[in-house]
Interface confidence: medium
Amino acid sequence: GYKAEVMVSQVYSGSLRVLNRHFSQDLTRRESSAFRSETAKAQKMLKELITSTRLGTYYNSSSVYSFGEGPLTCFFWFILQIPEHRRLMLSPEVVQALLVEELLSTVNSSAAVPYRAEYEVDPEGLVILEASVKDIAALNSTLGCYRYSYVGQGQVLRLKGPDHLASSCLWHLQGPKDLMLKLRLEWTLAECRDRLAMYDVAGPLEKRLITSVYGCSRQEPVVEVLASGAIMAVVWKKGLHSYYDPFVLSVQPVVFQACEVNLTLDNRLDSQGVLSTPYFPSYYSPQTHCSWHLTVPSLDYGLALWFDAYALRRQKYDLPCTQGQWTIQNRRLCGLRILQPYAERIPVVATAGITINFTSQISLTGPGVRVHYGLYNQSDPCPGEFLCSVNGLCVPACDGVKDCPNGLDERNCVCRATFQCKEDSTCISLPKVCDGQPDCLNGSDEEQCQEGVPCGTFTFQCEDRSCVKKPNPQCDGRPDCRDGSDEEHCDCGLQGPSSRIVGGAVSSEGEWPWQASLQVRGRHICGGALIADRWVITAAHCFQEDSMASTVLWTVFLGKVWQNSRWPGEVSFKVSRLLLHPYHEEDSHDYDVALLQLDHPVVRSAAVRPVCLPARSHFFEPGLHCWITGWGALREGGPISNALQKVDVQLIPQDLCSEVYRYQVTPRMLCAGYRKGKKDACQGDSGGPLVCKALSGRWFLAGLVSWGLGCGRPNYFGVYTRITGVISWIQQVVT
């Protein structure tokens, strides 16, 4: 019998250029008579154009919703009712070709053509894109608050904020032909629930979404987004009601930046330069294509690419890469944003060099990508260290910490976290190396103590990049480096002339002169430690709640002992900058460190002095008794302490602690405490210092109070941010 044909709605969006009309400001106001009159004419023309082609039989509805420059650009959508079996045949490309063919056929025709009665449509300026019913609904919901802006070359246009009576607004942005638009979004409030979506076309087409941002992101307080061309749309959806705009939007046209380069690398190891997507740190644009050709001076070397918070992964099957596609020597890899460093090592087998391509495969983009490039020795990629094949990084080997996710850096160690005697491979405690007393059979622990040695896990790297054998030589009163750099920056770590943490005792004035109290509205929230004249270090999780993210809330007290009273040695500061570690992850507590820049430098006194920062190679030996200090609760769930408490805790081997916490302990963590519990940090101690005394009498910062199960519970140690694991970031910020 007769079976009705199944019809489906196919939605298209697009724009066309009218050559015999000019854009005027009246056309930006939907309520103006000019807008109403122009849309009526344009709509009639659009319908006539479509129905003049064989698409006419499928025509359902259409709408012109906006105008722009060029001389006059009309933005529209239309719906065709198509038999289901023809759906794929009428792709946007086919529909565009049919409409262009129709326009071209009448360009030189003298016959009266209805759609040409008023408008001279440019066939080359017609664009047809795929859309959906959902896209049209999203567009219609913004039309009560629709703003069109044209931004000229060399201009930076600050966009007017949204209409807070509306629930959704759309900024339709256009720039000069052949340029690309760069949108800058700056969040101005600490917390909000507003959502902003940026599109690579004039309307909110889901398939052309560049990115969407939500809720006053602290991770990205400023976001710069590039369109692939001169048109862009930004849609705002209201969050919580607010009289203040939680963001500032500005837009500017920029020229296309070529992303192609030919480089010849020098005959040296380490980083030699940087490659980045155009306008880094802006988000890369939806049609980015970069091609970098690097020539390596010799086959002894391989090429290393060092990424920051971005990794390359093999993509199973042939799925598109959602965070950038890379091709390196014909290998296809997908980019992936991660909260870790990563290196891609490319073995070089021919002198022709290496070509690296980066492409944004889909319209959805992300933060610009930057990569440091350099050479490594193919026969010894990590001198004195271990090459972690999982992430391409060189990590310390046999130091008692599994730095590589697969733990291979701690496998097959003859001597773990100890010194291996040359003579018979016996292992001796690190403090016994270069201490003036031979402990190895033929005294190999005391050899080469006055000269440079190859750099390794426990060697100290001097400023001139040479290494010394003596472990932990910093600030011990004896210059070990040729350039004396091990004895520089040593005005630290000394206690003042001093006369609760769970299981602790009260501290005296000047006993812990680096201890900081971080307060909000007069209430102690977290501990911290002074590490430089204008910098205090603390835990990132202290700022986890959006309401705690603003610098203006915080006051830092130094030289304090009692919470409920002040004494002459105590000083307070406002915070001018707050920096969380870029890899900090709230759920895992990884990289739990933050730096606060004080509004003015400290004046050092007996009660206010910085603690010493360890070098990356500094070894804090398990079993060592160190100290934690703070005003935290004296018992689990209790109130904070009035007096600054101190307690000694023992450093715990990493794998023992990792076992207790079911392998949630990362290489950036360090454990301390006792199996019996009792002595531990507690709520309110977070961010406070774990310090260990060196033989020189100076105190070094080993950790920051981070997390743990309860307080002082048997079998559960306190977990601290391992300072040696984040020291390079600290030094980069502070210096």
Epitope: C427, E621, G623, Q650, L656, G673, Y674, R675, P714
Partner: antibody
Framework: QVQLQQSGAEVKKPGASVKVSCTAS????????INWVRQATGQGLEWMGR????????GYAQKFQGRVTMTRNTSISTAYMELSSLRSEDTAVYYC???????????WGQGTLVTVSS | DIQMTQSPKSVSASVGDRVTITCRAS??????LAWYQQKPGQSPKLLIY???SLQSGVPSRFSGSGSGTDFTLTISSLQPEDFATYYC?????????FGQGTKLEIK
């Protein structure tokens, strides 16, 4: 100075029980574990178990489970180890030793010889 | 339980000699290993803990090394008072276990 003073030698018949005491001085017993280790003549050291004097929590080696009981009286800084159902192979010197949390046993008592003989 | 194996069972040496005693754990004990000295009729005395840390009051001729499963006690220059039995013990997890001992005798 730190000292652990143990009770005197005992001679017991098979099937009987023995209770050895260990009195601490020079430190707070509640800050440490008290471990019990035994050594049969000419043999090595064997860990029997330990008690946390602060809360009385105990941990025993599987071999002694059900036969050993460790108790304490913090008011007199004393820990006790009672071993029941004695057999001739329990003849040994019994030592108490303190340990701080994760560290090994740093101070030991002088030992108490327990002889099990019919 | 973690088994501790010491070698050799006994060793003969002279005053001034360098002596090495080894201890192997049946599983990884990180650096949680101690060495004790025991003389006839006396209680054991702690020499080394955490594999390499010298207990206060112990002469520096005693040193410990190793990590994981293999450990060494070294006496760099034997003195007459060093002739005794030496035990290793893991303090990584309970039940704590000892090696069977190494008797150091005068040659």
């Amino acid at each position: 100075q730190v000292q652990l003073q143990q009770s005197g030698a005992e001679v017991k018949k098979p099937g009987a029980s023995v209770k050895v005491s260990c009195t601490a001085s020079g430190f707070n017993i509640e800050d440490y574990y008290i471990n019990w280790v035994r050594q049969a003549t000419g043999q090595g050291l064997e860990w029997m178990g330990r008690i946390d004097p602060e809360d009385g929590e105990t941990g025993y080696a599987q071999k002694f489970q059900g036969r050993v009981t460790m108790t304490r009286n913090t008011s007199i800084s004393t820990a006790y180890m009672e071993l029941s159902s004695l057999r001739s192979e329990d003849t040994a010197v019994y030592y108490c030793a303190r340990s701080i949390y994760l560290d090994p046993m740093d101070y030991w008592g002088q030992g108490t010889l327990v002889t099990v003989s019919s | 339980d973690i088994q501790m194996t010491q070698s050799p069972k006994s060793v003969s040496a002279s005053v001034g000699d360098r002596v090495t005693i080894t201890c192997r754990a049946s599983q990884d004990v990180t650096t949680a290993l101690a060495w004790y000295q025991q003389k006839p009729g006396q209680s054991p005395k702690l020499l080394i803990y955490w594999a390499t840390s010298l207990q206060s009051g112990v002469p520096s001729r005693f040193s410990g090394s190793g990590s994981g499963t293999d450990f060494t006690l070294t006496i760099s220059s034997l003195q007459p008072e060093d002739f005794a039995t030496y035990y290793c013990q893991q303090h990584y997890s309970t039940p704590y276990t000892f090696g069977q001992g190494t008797k150091l005798e005068i040659k």
